[in-house]
């Protein structure tokens, strides 16, 4: 029966005399008068089984003590730690030259675990053991014995086990503890590779190459290897493993990404929070699911936010010229969170009596610069039929539009070819300019060509260069443009619309808003 004693993780104990409860019962030769098993108290008042011999008065002592058989458990080199105490020869009563202060350590390899007798000739000498410290009888006071600790190693061993023997040649000595152990490199995890318990090599300089196996939920990047050194220390880690997708390294393990996190690839990166507009509901996510109404394009990385189709283009303007139509519009208010926005034009030819009966325009119609994938916000459509109703749809599209096409993503206009539109307006005036508004007025076109249904005012900041404009429609020949920025130059165009369509825009009127209110009467020229 052995009690538990704590030793370093890289040592595996094969024998520990201090852990044995009761008598050790080792074999002594001679049976009496030599080594004697004695129980003493240690510093914690716990009994320890020790072997002592003190035949210091007679010369030519040859007292042997042999351990029980010790299995080697596959170890090729074992270590023997001996704790012993030795009395100074000078402290012994009447002793002269017969007293020694050393003893000898021997071993004998054997497959037989039940050898009953000590045959001295079978044993090989490991070393002569001398004390670093011996003591006089006065030194033993306060129960503090001067313990010497000596460690020797022996190998390579090849048989199933071995016996140790201690030869006394006339010392006054006690073996307080004998521990036999071998060294191993303990199971460890390095670079996410697990290396098993590995017994050290036969030589004190040998290195044992060990291949590691990737921990759960990881895969090899480079073949993981380490070397087990003779002292039981792992050396020179080579190669590594990486946590699989959906897992990250934590304390040498690959843990599943938490809910709300993901990892797309086998890398040494940590799990990342789900990108905007996405979520994960399970641990170990390799990607995050897009929120309802949000999507990920085929070539979008898992790290990109989920996006949605854009809203409809704004401010669609048409200009009919016989069998040609020019269309212009503004970017959608919501791009869906993407940069890859483009526009598609859908042309439908509709019956005069029933506008709902429309058919695709066909291949005879031409679009400049193109019909689909437009990057600009204008298109010219030519080769239309005369006296025909056409409906044009402008669709805003991005990389995820195909996942959720909806009429909400388009704006349309219906025109009739070959009807004369009104002429352009000759004079536009700024009646009043304040910090935040401009009051405009204009004359009816010289040639209305029908009933003027409404006027359309297009304006924009001069330095925006028509990239971002706004439209105001009115039935009157004047309007107040509000919500402007002070001290800013604006450009204004006005055109009229009849049933035949829009006329051309007027010449630009440039007006700069004030810092203080004032009245300016425009005369058609640029006002400042």
């Amino acid at each position: 029966v052995t009690g538990s004693r704590v030793y370093p993780a890289n040592e595996v104990t094969l024998l520990d005399s201090r852990s044995v409860q009761g008598e050790l019962g080792w074999i002594a030769s001679p049976l009496e008068g030599g080594w004697e098993e004695v129980s003493i108290m240690d510093e914690k008042n716990t009994p320890i089984r020790t072997y002592q011999v003190c035949n210091v008065m007679e010369a030519s002592q040859n007292n042997w003590l042999r351990t029980d058989w010790i299995t080697r458990e596959g170890a090729q080199r074992v270590y023997i730690e001996i704790k012993f105490t030795l009395r100074d020869c000078n402290s012994l009563p009447g002793v002269m030259g017969t007293c020694k202060e050393t003893f000898n350590l021997y071993y004998y390899e054997s497959d037989n675990d039940k050898e009953r007798f000590i045959r001295e000739s079978q044993f090989g000498k490991i070393d002569t053991i001398a004390a670093d410290e011996s003591f006089t009888q006065v030194d033993i006071g306060d129960r503090i014995m001067k313990l010497n600790t000596e460690i020797r190693d022996v190998g390579p061993l090849s048989k199933k086990g071995f016996y140790l023997a201690f030869q006394d040649v006339g010392a006054c000595i006690a073996l307080v503890s004998v521990r036999v152990f071998y060294k191993k490199c303990p199971l460890t995890v390095r670079n996410l590779a697990q290396f098993p318990d590995t017994i050290t090599g036969a030589d004190t300089s040998s290195l044992v190459e060990v291949r590691g196996s990737c921990v759960n939920n990881s895969e090899e990047k480079d073949v993981p290897k380490m070397y087990c050194g003779a002292d039981g220390e792992w050396l020179v880690p080579i190669g590594n493993c990486l946590c699989n997708a959906g897992h990250e390294e934590q304390n040498g393990e690959c843990q599943a990404c938490k809910i709300g996190y993901y990892k797309a690839l086998s890398t040494d990166a940590s799990c990342a929070k789900c990108p905007p507009h996405s979520y994960s509901v399970w641990e170990g996510a390799t990607s995050c699911t897009c929120d309802r109404g949000f999507f990920r394009a085929d070539n979008d990385a898992a790290s990109m936010p989920c996006t949605r189709p854009p809203s409809a283009p704004l401010n669609l303007i048409s200009n009919v010229n016989e069998t040609s139509v020019n269309l212009e519009w503004s970017s959608p208010q919501n791009t869906g969170g993407r940069q890859d926005i483009s526009y598609n034009v859908v042309c439908k030819k509709c019956g005069a009596g029933d506008p709902s009966k429309c058919r695709p325009c066909g291949s005879g119609v031409h679009y400049t610069p193109q019909q689909n994938g437009l990057k600009t916000t204008r298109v010219s459509i030519t080769d239309l039929l005369a006296h025909t109703n056409y409906t044009f749809e402008i669709w805003a599209v991005n990389g995820v539009s195909k996942y959720n096409p909806s009429p909400d993503q388009s704006v349309s206009v219906t025109v009739t070819t070959n009807q004369a539109a009104p002429s352009s307006i000759a004079l536009v005036q700024a009646k009043e300019v304040t910090r935040y508004s401009v009051a405009l007025a204009w004359l009816e076109p010289d040639r209305p060509n029908g009933v003027i249904l409404e006027y359309e005012v297009k304006y924009y900041e001069k330095d925006q260069n028509e990239r971002s404009y706004r439209i105001v429609r009115t039935a009157a020949r004047n309007t107040d443009i509000k919500g402007l920025n002070p001290l800013t130059s604006y450009v204004f165009h006005v055109r009229a619309r009849t049933a035949a369509g829009y006329g051309d825009f007027s010449e630009p009127l440039e007006v700069t808003t004030n810092t203080v209110p004032s009245r300016i009467i425009g005369d058609g020229a640029n006002s400042t």
Partner: antibody, heavy 121, light 106 residues
């Protein structure tokens, strides 16, 4: 078994000498030192000294030098205590005791039965 | 030389009781202090040696402890055959005994 056998009581006159034998049996005589202890009537134990049975080298305690001699005859495994110029205060039981020397200290593990020496005129 | 003082000089106990004997040294000595028992008309016999190792044939009701200058011999339950004189001994360069404690029937 291990035994130390001492002679019977001795009655001596002051100034005389006495030689007390201690015969050992049951172990190798020369392997253990022999100690001598005195016990005056009604008194405690008093260590007199020892002799190395292997070399014959004696060690005397303070107060037991001069008139006290330890000697050996290894051929008959016997140790001797000789007291000369006996005085009345030498009246005591004299014990021989085998010295057990261990790592953990020295003691006397086997004792003779004692020899009473009476000094009286 | 080192003087060992034992106390009490006489200890009166009834059979079955616990007896505690003290031995005090004039200076620090080894903790491996031997104790001896001597019955009237008999030679002393070794009782305890080492730190607290009982000699052959000594029952386990005898135990010893102590270190430095103060030592104790304890008889856990005194038996009739334990009534005797008990001596402690130190084995410095010059060996000495305590003057003894007599354990007698109460």
């Amino acid at each position: 078994q291990v035994q130390l056998l001492q002679s019977g009581a001795e009655v001596k006159k002051p100034g005389a000498s006495v030689k007390v034998p201690c015969k050992a049996s049951g172990y190798t005589f020369t392997s253990r030192a022999m100690s001598w202890v005195r016990q005056a009537p009604g008194q405690g134990l008093e260590w007199m000294g020892w002799i190395n049975t292997n070399t014959g080298n004696p060690t005397y305690a303070q107060g037991f030098t001069g008139r006290f001699v330890f000697s050996l005859d290894t051929s008959v495994s016997t140790a001797y205590l000789q007291i000369s110029s006996l005085k009345a205060e030498d009246t005591a039981v004299y014990y021989c005791a085998r010295v057990r020397t261990t790592v953990y200290g020295d003691n006397m593990d086997v004792w003779g039965q004692g020899t009473l020496v009476t000094v009286s005129s | 030389e080192i003087v060992l003082t034992q106390s009490p000089a006489t200890l009166s106990v009834s059979p079955g009781e616990r007896a505690t004997l003290s031995c005090r040294a004039s200076q620090s000595v080894s903790s491996n202090l031997p104790w001896y028992q001597q019955k009237p008309g008999q030679a002393p016999r070794l009782l305890i040696y080492g730190a607290s190792t009982r000699a052959t044939g000594i029952p386990d009701r005898f135990s010893a402890s102590g270190s430095g200058t103060d030592f104790t011999l304890t008889i856990s339950r005194v038996e009739p055959e334990d009534f005797a004189v008990y001596y402690c001994q130190q084995y410095g360069p010059s060996w000495t005994f305590g003057q003894g404690t007599k354990v007698e029937i109460k």
